[in-house]
């Protein structure tokens, strides 16, 4: 009933509550000397399915008959209209529209822990639309039966709050799940299990590793379980991967030795549970362990390479390069290098730790035969010494690789490829490609990359260190045995044209020619390799095109010679520069007017 | 000190109902579980039902699951027994008991006489066929 009603009733057959798809039957009458004033037949009732007008009879009473209700709960009001004056409000009354429940699904019933409670949970089918009430039972030895309500709109969860205990592990417990509601109910299939199928262990907790020793090849987990445990299982993992190893374990008691981890490593480890070998589950996995693995000695041996500069009739700078060993060969922090420094004739040597760089320049006669052996130290030894012997790498020309190219290769990658030297191909025994920025100053300070590649291979792909817009010195060594020969090329991954002409900074008069000197373009503004100077000059004030003169581009040319310029011509000069994606736009420009006598 | 005294025992005949009450006073009602015993002559006392603190969890004896229902009405300090259905073995003196609560609930937490720390007199039920 919607209100007190006073004037009349609403009565609804056969129940407020129905099925979908079936028909009402809703009767509203006045109760007596509640009509208009004056004629009964002059009342008018009124039915409202929620606001909306259904059906009205002039008299004491209506009655009407409803089908197609949907599901849900919709309002009737029936309201009396009388001659003069507003309608007024009967009686109302509510009607719910549902289904009886569905048989619940796949009922399961899981006990969190040893000291855990039994909670079960279940599919509920399609909504009823009504108020539902489940009731879970779960009966057990002893005859007993515990019995749960749960009145949430939705229930498909509820706990008993009851522990099962492994007295007797094997006892058979079944769990029913049983939803009524007005229009009927429906009990779940039996769930039938034991205390050992349906106690999902904690994840383990305090977990520890220990390292005999401070060696990784002696490693041991421990951690702590619940009292029933029978199985576990291991995953760990090195902190950068994302594939698990995976280790099954027998009573192992809390602890399980560890054979197979990579020194000075990062691990995660994670544990999990089981009371049973088939029966129950597995525990959530537990919380995860980070540690780091103790230092090994470094294996492996350093990559080395070298530089040697001409100082002086007696004396040579050598400049030595190593790549830093991998993780796993390094196996530890590394803590200094040892550069080792040996006259092999005289017997002479120098010995040096190198801490923070991965060079080392010296100054040596240029007389005796020099080599060095690089290794690399961490806390617990030394790698392998890297030997090698000093020697001019470009000195024998029938060694040199010929017809060396550079090109582009997609983004800030350059392929550099070659033909074997004339001289026995198969004498060679390695190729070293080595790169490093163009730098027209000849900057020894400018990191020096090199990839070594086998005797048979005839390119190489560089990337490492490459940055678009830049030109780099590319050279080909070809080795073999105590001999090296060489070749270079200009190469760029990506170029455009220069962002600026060079700059004429002086132009000097020599016997009837001008001499023509500028400032390098600032490497910045090179935008690749150049390729070509361009001098042009026009006589002022002429609207004639400009004459010009274009220069192959060496890296340490910074002047030239014209003398096609007539004597007392005033001419003014400027200067551009080309990449192989075209041409700058034009430097600063220079009068100048030649004094020489006229022919 | 909790006393509890029980009510609603009587003659009824095989087929018939009852509704025990059990009124509770000197004590925190709703801080206990509730549980009904029975004894009939010459036997040992024997479990029948018992409701837990919230009143939502409850636990039968199956020989009587589904004709007995337990009940609670914390506000009253009342615990109920609604008997439906009656059957002769059902004759017994009725108990009503109070459980203090225990850290942990197990499957048989509450179904033993010795869970419980205060007892009722008992009222007599007994069902003519």
């Known amino acids: 009933k919607i209100d007190a009603c006073k004037r009349g009733d609403v009565t609804v057959k056969p129940s407020h509550v129905i099925l979908l798809g079936s028909t009402v039957n809703i009767t509203c009458s006045l109760k007596p000397r509640q009509g208009c004033f004056h004629y009964s037949r002059r009342n008018k009732l009124i039915l409202y399915k929620f606001d909306r007008r259904i059906n009205f009879h002039h008299g004491h009473s209506l009655n009407s008959q409803v089908t197609g209700l949907p599901l849900g709960t919709t309002l009737f009001v029936c309201k009396l209209a009388c001659i003069n004056s507003d309608e007024i409000q009967i009686c109302g009354a509510e009607i719910f529209v549902g289904v009886a429940p569905e048989q619940p699904q796949n009922l399961s019933c899981i006990q969190k822990g040893e000291q855990g409670t039994v909670a079960c949970t279940w599919e509920r089918g399609r909504d009823t639309h009504l108020y539902t009430e489940y009731t879970l039972q779960l009966s057990g030895p002893k005859n007993l039966t515990w019995q749960k309500q749960c009145k949430d709109i939705y229930c498909d969860y509820l706990d008993f709050g009851i522990n099962l205990t492994p007295e007797s592990p094997e006892s058979n417990f079944t769990a029913k799940v049983t939803a009524v509601n007005s229009l009927g109910s429906s009990s779940s299939l039996p769930s039938t299990f034991t205390f050992l199928d349906i106690v999902r262990p904690l994840p383990p907790w305090d977990i520890r590793i220990k390292f005999q020793k401070a060696s990784v090849s002696r490693c041991t987990l421990y951690w702590r379980d619940e009292g029933l445990v029978l199985l576990n299982r291991l995953r760990y993992r090195p902190s950068n991967s994302r594939l698990w190893n995976m280790v099954n374990v027998t009573k192992a008691k809390g602890r399980h030795d560890l054979l197979d981890l990579k020194p000075f490593t990062e691990y995660e480890f994670q544990i999990s549970s089981k009371l049973h070998l088939y029966k129950g589950s597995w525990s959530d996995w537990s919380e995860s362990l980070r540690a780091q693995t103790p230092e090994e000695e470094p294996t492996g041996m350093l990559d080395v390479w070298y530089m040697k500069r001409h100082i002086d009739y007696s004396r040579q700078q050598i400049s030595l390069f190593w790549k830093n060993l991998s993780v796993s060969e390094a196996r530890g922090k590394i803590l200094h290098y040892q550069v080792t420094l040996q006259e092999l004739t005289g017997g002479k040597a120098m010995t040096q730790n190198i801490t923070g760089h991965t060079s080392w320049t010296t100054v040596i006669p240029r007389t005796g035969n020099w080599a060095v052996a690089v290794s690399a130290a961490n806390s617990k030894g030394s790698s392998l010494p890297t030997r090698i012997n000093i020697m001019n790498l470009c000195e024998a020309g029938l060694l040199a690789p010929r017809q060396v190219s550079a090109n582009s290769e997609g983004m800030d990658n350059i392929l550099v490829t070659w033909q074997p030297p004339r001289k026995d191909p198969s004498a060679v025994q390695e190729y070293v490609v080595e790169w490093r920025e163009l730098h027209p100053g000849g900057d020894t300070q400018v990191p020096l990359n090199w990839l070594r590649s086998r005797p048979y291979n005839v390119s190489a792909l560089i990337s490492e260190n490459i940055k678009s817009y830049i030109c780099y010195e590319i050279r080909v060594y070809a080795l073999s045995g105590d001999q090296g020969g060489c070749s270079s090329i200009l190469g760029n991954s990506k170029h455009k044209a220069p962002l600026s002409g060079p700059h004429i900074n002086a132009i000097t008069e020599e016997k009837g020619s001008i001499l023509i000197s500028w400032n390098s373009i600032p490497v910045q503004e090179q935008m690749g390799c150049l390729l070509h100077y361009r001098i042009y000059w026009k006589e002022r004030d002429s609207n004639s095109q400009p004459q010009l003169c274009e220069i192959p581009y060496r890296v340490s040319q910074n002047s030239h010679p014209i003398n096609s310029l007539q004597p007392r011509v005033t001419y003014v000069l400027w200067m551009t520069a080309l990449t192989a994606a075209g041409e700058s736009s034009h430097g600063n420009e220079r009068e100048f007017c030649l004094q020489g006598k006229a022919n | 000190q909790v006393q509890l005294v029980e009510s609603g025992g009587g003659l009824v005949q095989a087929g018939g109902s009852l509704k025990l009450s059990c009124a509770a006073s000197g004590g925190t009602f709703s801080s206990y579980a509730m549980g009904w015993f029975r004894q009939a002559p010459g036997k040992e006392r024997e479990f029948v039902a018992a409701?837990?603190?919230?009143?939502?969890?409850?636990v039968y004896v199956n020989s009587v699951k589904g004709r007995f229902t337990v009940s609670r009405d914390n506000a009253k300090n009342t615990v109920y027994l609604q008997m439906n259905s009656l059957k002769p073995e059902d004759a017994a003196v009725y108990y009503c008991?109070?459980?203090?609560?225990?850290?942990?609930?197990?499957?048989?937490?509450?179904?033993?006489?010795?869970?419980?720390?205060?007892w009722g007199q008992g009222t007599q039920v007994s069902v003519s066929s």
């Open positions: 008991a109070a459980g203090r609560p225990v850290s942990r609930t197990s499957y048989y937490t509450y179904t033993y006489p010795h869970d419980y720390d205060y």
């Open positions: 409701i837990m603190r919230s009143g939502g969890t409850t």
